[in-house]
């Protein structure tokens, strides 16, 4: 015998209290698949979260973060404070990158400058707190007397800011 609940489409639930008829999901709830016996409560985007997509009867709300914060975790389960380029977030707040490291985004960690010699290349543009070095040709490719290092390009916002 076919389960009568299998006929209930997304946006409804199979209501045991009403002889297993398909009832619409109540306000602030949803069912994203058919044949559900309950509707799920919609996620609420509060505080540092803001609504990216409203809840509907067939899909959950989606949150992102208010300006100055960025998403972390699956489905933006957490919001983390932004820092400036050239900084990283520590337990004590935003701290400048140490010499030899950089961060070209408002999130994430300071990473070591690329080791150009790893690829047999020279440093074409010096690194800064906000920018990685740019590796150039191998030292053998440089013409005699040519300067191998260019001063770093000035870092500007937004730089490699997360979208």
């Amino acid at each position: 015998l076919q389960d009568p609940c299998s006929n209930c489409p997304a946006g409804t639930f199979c209501d045991n209290n009403r002889n297993q008829i398909c009832s619409p999901c109540p306000p602030n709830s949803f069912s994203s698949a058919g044949g559900q016996r309950t509707c799920d409560i919609c996620r609420q985007c509060k505080g540092v979260f803001r609504t990216r997509k409203e809840c509907s009867s067939t899909s959950n709300a989606e949150c992102d973060c208010t300006p100055g914060f960025h998403c972390l975790g699956a489905g933006c389960s957490m919001c983390e404070q932004d820092c400036k380029q050239g900084q990283e977030l520590t337990k004590k707040g935003c701290k400048d990158c140490c010499f030899g490291t950089f961060n070209d985004q408002k999130r994430g960690i300071c990473r070591p400058w690329t080791n150009c010699s790893l690829d047999g290349k020279s440093v074409l543009v010096n690194g800064t707190k906000e920018r990685d070095v740019v590796c150039g040709p191998s030292p053998a490719d440089l013409s005699p007397g040519a300067s191998s290092v260019t001063p770093p390009a000035p870092a500007r916002e937004p730089g490699h800011s997360p979208q």
Partner: antibody, heavy 119, light 107 residues
Framework: QVQLVQSGAEVKKPGASVKVSCKAS????????INWVKQAPGQGLEWIGN????????NYNQKFKDKATITADKSTSTAYMELSSLRSEDTAVYYC????????????WGQGTTVTVSS | DIQMTQSPSSLSASVGDRVTITCRPS??????LNWYQQKPDKTVKLLIY???RLRSGVPSRFSGSGSGTDFTFTISSLQPEDIATYFC?????????FGQGTKLEIK
């Protein structure tokens, strides 16, 4: 020598998912970003996102945030891109690329993987 | 996102001709501008990085110049093997973006 070898062509039905692989060799996999780039038929190039295999840190183009998931397996020097809820507009050649020296240009490209979405 | 306006979209030139392609980002990208060649078989190759730096192994007939919001790619003497589509790309700001490409044909 540096090589990026991608998995073969895929044909998928709308709504399905596909996972494209990119096996790197000839360099230290964990020291360079791997990027993914889309080229739809007759179109230009679109950056999807990238991953730093050392710690699996990722960046995504907002346009592809709900479409693509980029991962990396350090033990096999392989990067992956999974595309979900496929639609006809996802039909394209997908390239993996490596950054050049620092994360601002792409010096090596895979041969491309054609993904066709058709019912 | 930074828009990259590349022109022309296609051009036809003779062997030995000087060929110039321009790329104009919608905002200042310093020198973080790269040029790629895509051959008819779909293989892609980096030719020039950081505006004017020739990638090792790339023939010296290819060159690049410019800064900020105005960049130029030049082939000083076109060769038959240069038949390809050429793309510019900015590496200054995420998401990285490409020009729409210039399809180069031999007359």
């Amino acid at each position: 020598q540096v090589q990026l070898v991608q998995s073969g062509a895929e044909v998928k039905k709308p709504g399905a998912s596909v996972k494209v692989s990119c096996k790197a060799s000839g360099y230290t996999f964990t020291s360079y970003w791997i990027n993914w780039v889309k080229q739809a038929p007759g179109q230009g190039l679109e950056w999807i996102g990238n991953i730093y295999p050392s710690d699996s840190y990722t960046n995504y183009n907002q346009k592809f945030k709900d479409k693509a998931t980029i991962t990396a397996d350090k033990s096999t020097s392989t990067a992956y891109m999974e595309l979900s809820s496929l639609r006809s507009e996802d039909t394209a050649v997908y390239y993996c690329t490596r950054d050049y020296g620092s994360s601002y240009s792409f010096d090596y490209w895979g041969q491309g993987t054609t993904v066709t979405v058709s019912s | 996102d930074i828009q990259m306006t590349q022109s022309p979209s296609s051009l036809s030139a003779s062997v030995g001709d000087r060929v110039t392609i321009t790329c104009r980002p919608s905002q200042d990208i310093s020198n973080y501008l790269n040029w790629y060649q895509q051959k008819p078989d779909k293989t892609v190759k980096l030719l020039i990085y950081y505006t004017s730096r020739l990638r090792s192994g790339v023939p010296s007939r290819f060159s690049g110049s410019g800064s900020g919001t105005d960049f130029t790619f030049t082939i000083s003497s076109l060769q038959p093997e240069d038949i390809a589509t050429y793309f510019c790309q900015q590496g200054d700001t995420l998401p990285y973006t490409f020009g729409q490409g210039t399809k180069l044909e031999i007359k």
